[in-house]
Interface confidence: medium
C-alpha cells in the first residue's frame, strides 16, 4: 500500500486524548485469550504495540504534514490528507480506506443513480405542485392543513462547525444554513468559516466573495478540539437514559464525560430549553412548515 504523505506507519506521534498519548489496545480489540502479548493482531493499521504493565498500548506514530489535500474515507469522513486518514485508522483500530480524492459530502438524493454507490453528483430536484415551487430541499406537503413547503432536514447529528452566512447570521453548522434556507425558501450562502464578526458588513454578505471559503468538516485535522473532530464519541451507558431530553447522549472518550447533542431548536446542558432564535416554524405532522 502507499505510504501516507509526510510519514508512514510508525514514525513520530500522537494519539487520542492529546499529543503523545496512546490508545489502550485491549479496549479496542476484544481478545479471546487473557494472555496479553503483543502480536500482529494486537495493533493494526500502522500502529506500534507496546506491552505496558497489565495491558497493551497501541502507539500511532504518524507525523502528518498539514497540507490540505482532502480525501474521503470509507467511513464517510473527510480527512485533511491521506496521512490523517491512516492515522485515524490506527487510532481507532478500524479499517478506513480512501474512497476518493477530494472531500466527502452528504447527498440525500441519488438523482438518476440507481445504487447507493453511484451517487449522482449533486442533482437538485425542485418539486412543483399545489405549493408552487419548493426550493432548497423543501418538499410539498399537500396533505397538511395549510398546503406548504416543508423542511425535513435533521441537523441533530452534525458536529459544531460554525459558519457565517450571507444573511448576516452565524450558524453552528452548514447544515443549519441549509435548514434556514429551506425554511425561509430563500438563498442563504455560506460566507466564511467561523462565527460572523463585527467586521462582516451585512450589506456585502452574499455578494463578491473575499476568498474565505467554507471547508467541509475535516476529521482528525488537528490536535485541538479532538472531541469534535476525531469521532471518539461512544453511546452513553444505559444508566444515563433520559439524560438528554431533546437530543442524543454521547460519552466522550477523552474526557470520560457525557454530553448532549441537541436536536435543532433545543439548547441547554440536557437539551431541555427551546431555542426560539433558531427556528420560527409551525409544527405540522412532525415536519417543519415554512410560515
Amino acid at each position: 500500500s502507499n505510504q501516507p504523505p509526510g510519514g508512514g506507519g510508525g514514525s513520530g506521534g500522537d494519539c487520542p486524548g492529546g499529543k503523545g498519548k496512546s490508545i489502550n489496545c485491549s479496549e479496542l480489540n476484544v481478545r479471546e485469550s487473557d494472555v496479553r502479548v503483543c502480536d500482529e493482531s494486537s495493533c493494526k493499521y500502522g500502529g506500534v504495540c507496546k506491552e505496558d504493565g497489565d495491558g497493551l498500548k497501541c502507539a500511532c506514530q504518524f507525523q502528518c504534514h498539514t497540507n490540505y489535500i482532502p480525501v474521503c474515507g470509507s467511513n464517510g469522513d473527510t480527512y485533511q490528507n491521506e496521512c490523517f486518514l491512516r492515522r485515524a485508522a490506527c487510532k481507532h483500530q478500524k479499517e478506513i480506506t480512501v474512497i476518493a480524492r477530494g472531500p466527502c459530502y452528504s447527498d440525500n438524493g441519488s438523482g438518476s443513480g440507481e445504487g447507493e454507490e453511484e451517487g449522482s453528483g449533486a442533482e437538485v430536484h425542485r418539486k412543483h405542485s399545489k405549493c408552487g415551487p419548493c426550493k432548497y430541499k423543501a418538499e410539498c406537503d399537500e396533505d397538511a392543513e395549510n398546503v406548504g413547503c416543508v423542511c425535513n432536514i435533521d441537523c441533530s447529528g452534525y458536529s459544531f462547525n460554525p459558519v457565517c452566512a450571507s444573511d448576516g447570521s452565524s450558524y453552528n453548522n452548514p447544515c443549519f444554513v441549509r435548514e434556514a434556507s429551506c425554511i425561509k425558501q430563500e438563498q442563504i450562502d455560506i460566507r466564511h468559516l467561523g462565527h460572523c464578526t463585527d467586521t462582516d458588513d451585512t450589506s456585502l454578505l452574499g455578494k463578491k466573495d473575499d476568498g474565505l471559503q467554507y471547508r467541509p468538516d475535516v476529521k482528525d485535522a488537528s490536535d485541538q478540539r479532538e472531541d469534535v473532530y476525531i469521532g471518539n464519541h461512544m453511546p452513553c451507558p444505559e444508566n444515563l437514559n433520559g439524560y438528554c431530553i431533546h437530543g442524543k447522549c454521547e460519552f466522550i472518550y477523552s474526557t470520560q464525560k457525557a454530553s448532549c447533542r441537541c436536536e435543532s431548536g433545543y439548547t441547554g446542558q440536557h437539551c431541555e430549553k427551546t431555542d426560539f432564535s433558531i427556528l420560527y416554524v409551525v409544527p405540522s405532522r412532525q415536519k417543519l412548515t415554512h410560515v
Epitope: 474521503c72 464517510g76 474512497i99 476518493a100 480524492r101 477530494g102 472531500p103 466527502c104 459530502y105 452528504s106 447527498d107 441519488s110 438523482g111 438518476s112 443513480g113 440507481e114 445504487g115 447507493e116 454507490e117 453511484e118 451517487g119 449522482s120 453528483g121 449533486a122 442533482e123 437538485v124 432548497y136 430541499k137 459558519v163 452548514p174 447544515c175 444554513v177 441549509r178 434556507s181 438563498q187 450562502d189 455560506i190 471559503q213 467554507y214 467541509p216
Partner: antibody, heavy 122, light 112 residues
C-alpha cells in the same frame, strides 16, 4: 493512474451514425467513476454529451438525448458512444473523460483522453 | 440547464503578472452541505482539457499553488498569482451541481 484512449472512424456521412470507443487502462471501468463523453466543435467551447456508470446507468444532455446512446463493456474495460442522424454540426473533437464522484464525494473530471476528430461530410 | 458565463473572453497578460478570470452561473452552485459544485479546467493549444480546481476552491492533485479558486453561489473567480509561460491557453469553468454538466464559453489567456 487511469488513462483513456478514444478510437473510431474520423469521417462519418450525414444522416449516418457516429460510433466511438474509449479504452480504459491503468484502472477498472467498474470503479466508482462515471465515464463521460465531451465534444468540442472547431474553434468552439466544450459540450458535455453524456455519461455512464459501470452498472449501466446513464445521464444524457437533453439537447442530444434523442440521438445518443452510451454503453459499457466491462469485459473489455471500455465504453462507447453512438450518435445517430449526424449532420455537419456534429463535426468536432470528441473526448472521453472520467468524473470522480459518488454520493459522498466529488473530485471532478480528472482524466481526459487525447481526443479524436470526427468530421461529418459526404 | 444551468448557463455558465465567463468574462473576459480574452485576457492578454504579461508573464509574471497576476490574472483573474470570472465565471457566473445562472443559478446558485452552492450545494445544501456547503460545497460549491464548480470546477476549472485549462486547455492548452492542441491538447485535451486538464483539471485544475474542484468544488470551487480545491486545487487538483499536482496543480501549482499559484492557482486559486474563490467565490460562492453564482460568482466565481480563478486567480493566478503570477502567470507563467505554461499557463497560457483557454480556461473553462464547469458546473457539476445539476446534469447536464455545463461549461462556460472559455477565456483565452494570451501573452501580452
Amino acid at each position: 493512474q487511469v488513462q483513456l484512449q478514444e478510437s473510431g472512424p474520423g469521417l462519418v456521412k450525414p444522416s449516418g451514425t457516429l460510433s466511438l470507443t474509449c479504452a480504459v487502462s491503468g484502472g477498472s471501468i467498474s470503479s466508482s467513476n462515471w465515464w463521460s463523453w465531451v465534444r468540442q466543435p472547431p474553434g468552439k467551447g466544450l459540450e458535455w454529451i453524456g455519461e455512464i456508470y459501470h452498472s449501466g446507468s446513464t445521464n444524457y444532455n437533453p439537447s442530444l438525448k434523442s440521438r445518443v446512446t452510451i454503453s459499457v463493456d466491462k469485459s473489455k474495460n471500455q465504453f462507447s458512444l453512438k450518435l445517430s442522424s449526424v449532420t455537419a454540426a456534429d463535426t468536432a473533437v470528441y473526448y472521453c473523460a472520467t468524473m470522480v464522484r459518488g454520493r459522498y464525494y466529488y473530485y471532478g473530471m480528472d482524466v481526459w483522453g487525447q481526443g479524436t476528430t470526427v468530421t461529418v461530410s459526404s | 440547464d444551468i448557463v455558465m458565463t465567463q468574462s473576459p473572453l480574452s485576457l492578454p497578460v504579461t508573464p509574471g503578472e497576476p490574472a483573474s478570470i470570472s465565471c457566473r452561473s445562472s443559478q446558485s452552485l452552492l450545494h445544501s452541505d456547503g460545497y460549491n459544485f464548480l470546477d476549472w479546467y485549462l486547455q492548452k493549444p492542441g491538447q485535451s482539457p486538464q483539471f485544475l480546481i474542484y468544488l470551487g476552491s480545491n486545487r487538483a492533485s499536482g496543480v501549482p499553488d499559484r492557482f486559486s479558486g474563490v467565490g460562492s453561489g453564482t460568482d466565481f473567480t480563478l486567480q493566478i498569482s503570477r502567470v507563467e509561460a505554461e499557463d497560457f491557453g483557454v480556461y473553462y469553468c464547469m458546473q457539476a451541481l445539476q446534469a447536464p454538466w455545463t461549461f462556460g464559453q472559455g477565456t483565452k489567456l494570451e501573452i501580452k
